[in-house]
């Protein structure tokens, strides 16, 4: 007989204490964890369950994006009676269980954070053996990854009528402000498209018409720092070509 229960409540505070003798399933996760790109972060997750002294096989799972159906980023399994949860999956080798599932702790450490890790994560525990039961966090914990700006692309492109335009794309969190400077420009915020659709941390700024030869510099800045990159425009006057 395989039985499973979902409790409709999910506690968002790690401090909540359950003292009732007949525990119900619940999970305690914070709403959000913040960390900087390149650093490590800990995603806390503790749970209570109704199966007193459960000692059978268990699996701990973390998934990203959406509960129940999102892709797994971490999975480990502990054999009956064992406190060792043997890792079966760790995406890119960057996820490691900090907690002890036998002690109702599924907390996860994520190493070498990147902006792409900025998503919601959901913990899940599964029992099998004499007791079959599972429970998953419905709301999850949002991992908010911050990063100083980085210019990922800067280029000069041809426009109609032998003109040229410049594009600068930068990433960062908070999304950086972009500014162009160059010949006869001073400082220009220049048609910022921010952020790009489907690329939450990318910001693009365009200089629609480059009227003078010379060096054009794009500066990206947010609360964590600044970055700049330059392109050079040199046109062969009297001809239709250009050198950048």
């Amino acid at each position: 007989f395989v039985r499973t229960k979902i409790d409709t409540t999910e506690n968002l505070l790690n401090t909540e204490v359950h003292s009732s003798p007949a525990q119900r399933w619940s999970m305690q996760v914070p709403p959000e964890v913040s960390a900087e790109a390149g650093d490590a972060a800990v995603l806390p997750c503790t749970f209570t369950h109704p199966h007193r002294h459960y000692d059978g096989p268990l699996t701990a799972i973390w998934r990203a994006g959406e509960p129940y159906a999102g892709p797994q980023v971490f999975r480990c399994a502990a054999a009956r009676g064992s406190e060792l949860c043997q890792t079966a999956l760790s995406l890119h080798g960057r996820f490691r269980l900090l907690g002890n599932p036998r002690r109702n702790d599924l907390s996860l450490r994520v190493e070498r954070l990147a902006l792409a890790d900025d998503r919601r994560y959901f913990c899940r525990v599964e029992f099998a053996g004499d007791v079959h039961d599972r429970y998953e966090s419905r709301h999850g914990v949002r991992l908010h990854v911050t990063a100083a700006p980085r210019i990922v692309n800067i280029s000069v492109l041809p426009s109609p009528a032998h003109a040229f335009r410049a594009l600068c794309t930068a990433e960062g969190e908070p999304p950086p402000a972009l500014a162009w400077s160059g010949p006869a420009l001073g400082n220009s915020l220049a048609a910022v498209r921010s952020p790009r659709e489907g690329h939450g941390h990318l910001v693009t700024a365009e200089l629609p018409a480059l009227t003078h030869d010379g060096r054009y510099t794009c500066t990206a800045a947010n609360s964590l720092g600044r970055s700049e990159a330059s392109v050079y425009l040199f046109r062969f006057h009297g001809a239709s070509g250009a050198s950048t």
Partner: antibody, heavy 122, light 107 residues
Framework: EVQLLESGGGLVQPGGSLRLSCAAS????????MSWVRQAPGKGLEWVST????????YYADSVKGRFTISRDNSKNTLYLQMNSLRAEDTAVYYC???????????????WGQGTMVTVSS | DIQMTQSPSSVSASVGDRVTITCRAS??????LAWYQQKPGKAPKLLIY???FEHRGVPSRFSGSGSGTDFTLTISSLQPEDFATYYC?????????FGQGTKLEIK
């Protein structure tokens, strides 16, 4: 492309045997529980069997227990259903189905094969 | 075993109508319920899982609700492609069981 492709169905006499296969592609096969679900002509869906991602545990409907065996070869990304002592009431389209997000549990079946017809008749 | 009972067994409706299908479990299954759509000669397709979560790619006109023993699938505004048979299924305990199906026909 994420898909499941069943094969091995056909006509078999009562008491005979058949082995169904389900080839999976496009996902990490060993990470998910897999199941067989059948549908008799003009009837509804009936769960037949489930196997955990690593093959550690298998579960069966009472109607097939002792006659059918579910197995998987994770190195070949293939699920099997060995059907012995077949009866007329086993006549159905057999679907293999993937669990939505777990290697031990089938919270729901999010991916289905196209089905393979098994006819048991003399 | 847990029995799943769907109602109605069949329903006639027109494009644009709002349609509700109910599913009742013979015991408390918490939220472990899924809904599927099946068209003739085709495999079932997952619509809703864990009672209320829309499967990715499923149009937002499909929604699920309920917990315990009573569940509902609602199609807010019927489209021509929605005419099919719908099944509920519990995954609370093995043996997993399906409802008998609800055939949605064009009026």
């Amino acid at each position: 492309e994420v898909q499941l492709l069943e094969s091995g169905g056909g006509l078999v006499q009562p008491g005979g045997s058949l082995r169904l296969s389900c080839a999976a592609s496009g996902f990490t096969f060993s990470s998910y529980a897999m199941s067989w679900v059948r549908q008799a002509p003009g009837k509804g869906l009936e769960w037949v069997s489930t196997i955990t991602g690593g093959g550690e545990s298998t579960y069966y409907a009472d109607s097939v227990k002792g006659r059918f065996t579910i197995s998987r070869d994770n190195s070949k990304n293939t699920l099997y259903l060995q059907m012995n002592s077949l009866r007329a009431e086993d006549t159905a389209v057999y679907y293999c189905a993937k669990a939505i997000g777990s290697s031990w549990y089938s919270d729901a079946f999010d991916l289905w094969g196209q089905g393979t017809m098994v006819t048991v008749s003399s | 075993d847990i029995q799943m009972t769907q109602s109605p067994s069949s329903v006639s409706a027109s494009v644009g109508d709002r349609v509700t299908i109910t599913c009742r479990a013979s015991q408390d299954i918490s939220s472990w319920l899924a809904w599927y759509q099946q068209k003739p000669g085709k495999a079932p397709k997952l619509l809703i899982y864990v009672a209320s979560f829309e499967h990715r790619g499923v149009p937002s006109r499909f929604s699920g609700s309920g917990s315990g023993t009573d569940f509902t699938l609602t199609i807010s505004s019927l489209q021509p492609e929605d005419f099919a048979t719908y099944y509920c299924q519990q995954s609370y305990s093995i043996p997993y069981t399906f409802g008998q199906g609800t055939k949605l026909e064009i009026k």
